[in-house]
């Protein structure tokens, strides 16, 4: 038997993936655990194997279909259960009625690229990945730039309150190496959260022209 507090959190990427983390305070013997997904009105169900990510935390991804297929909508409710094997039987450890479009976390933006770079500014674009057509333009972004001698945590956040897949960074220092990251969040969903940060994009501003005051 398992004692202690259990926490079971899942997010839908808006297309064909539900990622879950199950945390259990208290001893859990070496045992096999799974997440089972049963939609309320769909003719499919899905299972994934929970794998340890820390001492008392396990995670798995329910792959519902091809990456860009729209497997769930705002009308759906999915019963999610954590099931652990106890001898020859399965025991239910956690359960939730999961509303996918209330619990969104999109994939990190991809394809970051420098469109144009100058001495003091840089124009960067990106793309969103595996985002549902249901959002239309109802997305927002946060971006941050890593300057020399600073950490990501110190970088000020820039907010784009609309679906804008580019940014023009201003007041940069000439001939300086920077890194840039962006993340995305739908406006929909009570428990919706930010996507992971994108892979950092490294770029260098152009040197100031010789003989010019800077």
């Amino acid at each position: 038997a398992v004692n202690g507090t259990s926490r079971f959190t899942c997010f839908y990427n808006s297309r064909a993936n539900i990622s879950c983390v199950w945390s259990q305070d208290g001893a859990l013997q070496d045992t096999s655990c799974q997440v089972h997904a049963w939609p309320d009105r769909r003719r499919w169900n899905q299972t994934c194997e929970l794998l340890p990510v820390s001492q008392a935390s396990w995670a798995c991804n329910l792959i519902l279909g091809t990456p860009d297929s729209q497997k769930l909508t705002a009308v759906d409710i999915v019963t999610l259960r954590v099931m652990c094997r106890e001898g020859v039987r399965w025991r239910m450890m956690a359960i939730q009625d999961f509303k996918p479009f209330e619990n969104l976390r999109l994939m990190a933006p991809i394809s970051l690229q420098v469109v144009h770079v100058e001495t003091h500014r840089c124009n960067i674009s990106w793309k969103i990945s595996q985002a549902s057509h249901y959002f239309e333009r109802h997305l927002e972004f946060e971006a941050r730039t890593l300057s020399p001698g600073h950490t990501w945590e110190e970088a000020p956040l820039m907010t784009l309150k609309q679906k804008q897949e580019w940014i023009c960074l201003e007041t940069l220092t000439p001939d300086t190496q920077y890194e840039f990251q962006v993340r995305v969040k739908p406006l929909q969903g009570e428990f919706t959260t930010w996507s992971p940060w994108s892979q950092p994009l490294a770029f260098r501003t152009k040197p100031a022209a010789l003989g010019k005051d800077t």
Partner: antibody, heavy 116, light 107 residues
Framework: QVQLVQSGAEVKKPGASVKVSCKAS????????IEWVRQAPGQGLEWMGE????????NHNEKFQGRVTMTRDTSTSTVYMELSSLRSEDTAVYYC?????????WGQGTTVTVSS | DIQMTQSPSSLSASVGDRVTITCKAS??????VAWYQQKPGKAPKSLIY???YRYSGVPSRFSGSGSGTDFTLTISSLQPEDFATYFC?????????FGQGTKLEIK
């Protein structure tokens, strides 16, 4: 096998209410949404709303908001749809249907005639 | 509300013909589209769900295709029992809506 059996035909006067029943068998009643769809004579299909018997959750077509009431009795595996303030344009065949994949099993239909 | 526009509204064909009915959604509904067959005085019968999946017991001559806004029901070789009215439906978002129907008649 899955079956949805509806109550018999009704004749009502304008302004009255009608309550149609739908008795389910052959599957786990609590697990699947029951939808209500109506069809006026010679017309297409119109979705009215749905109820999930296990939880009692309900979603309505806003067109019927305030006039339609959906309930369930889990002891008899029966769902009810009541439509109030009837008018002549509510004359139709009313169907209950289970939602699994799409609307996979349908009741035989209940004819409701609204006439003064 | 999402409008489902079916065409044609009526169609005359002969036994053995290949018949195609189309349905256009007013906005993207993914693959959340179903097709139903209805005969006079009877309840609709489910044929296709998720745009292309046939229910068990439905003959293989019925097939569905499409995604986004454009959907098709094809009957590869019409049989006498196929003469009926066909409806498409979206169940992607509330309120669920149906096409106006296509009446398939014997030529």
């Amino acid at each position: 096998q899955v079956q949805l059996v509806q109550s018999g035909a009704e004749v009502k006067k304008p302004g009255a209410s009608v309550k149609v029943s739908c008795k389910a068998s052959g599957y786990t009643f609590s697990r699947y949404w029951i939808e209500w769809v109506r069809q006026a004579p010679g017309q297409g299909l119109e979705w009215m709303g749905e109820i999930l018997p296990g939880s009692g959750s309900i979603n309505h077509n806003e067109k019927f908001q305030g006039r339609v009431t959906m309930t369930r009795d889990t002891s008899t595996s029966t769902v009810y749809m009541e439509l109030s303030s009837l008018r002549s344009e509510d004359t139709a065949v009313y169907y209950c249907t289970r939602h699994y994949g799409s609307f996979d099993y349908w009741g035989q239909g209940t004819t409701v005639t609204v006439s003064s | 509300d999402i409008q489902m526009t079916q065409s044609p509204s009526s169609l005359s064909a002969s036994v053995g013909d290949r018949v195609t009915i189309t349905c256009k959604a007013s906005q993207n509904v993914g693959t959340d589209v179903a097709w139903y067959q209805q005969k006079p005085g009877k309840a609709p019968k489910s044929l296709i769900y998720s745009a292309s999946y046939r229910y068990s017991g439905v003959p293989s001559r019925f097939s569905g295709s499409g995604s986004g806004t454009d959907f098709t029901l094809t009957i590869s070789s019409l049989q006498p029992e196929d003469f009926a009215t066909y409806f498409c439906q979206q169940y992607s978002s509330y309120p669920f809506t149906f096409g106006q129907g296509t009446k398939l008649e014997i030529k």
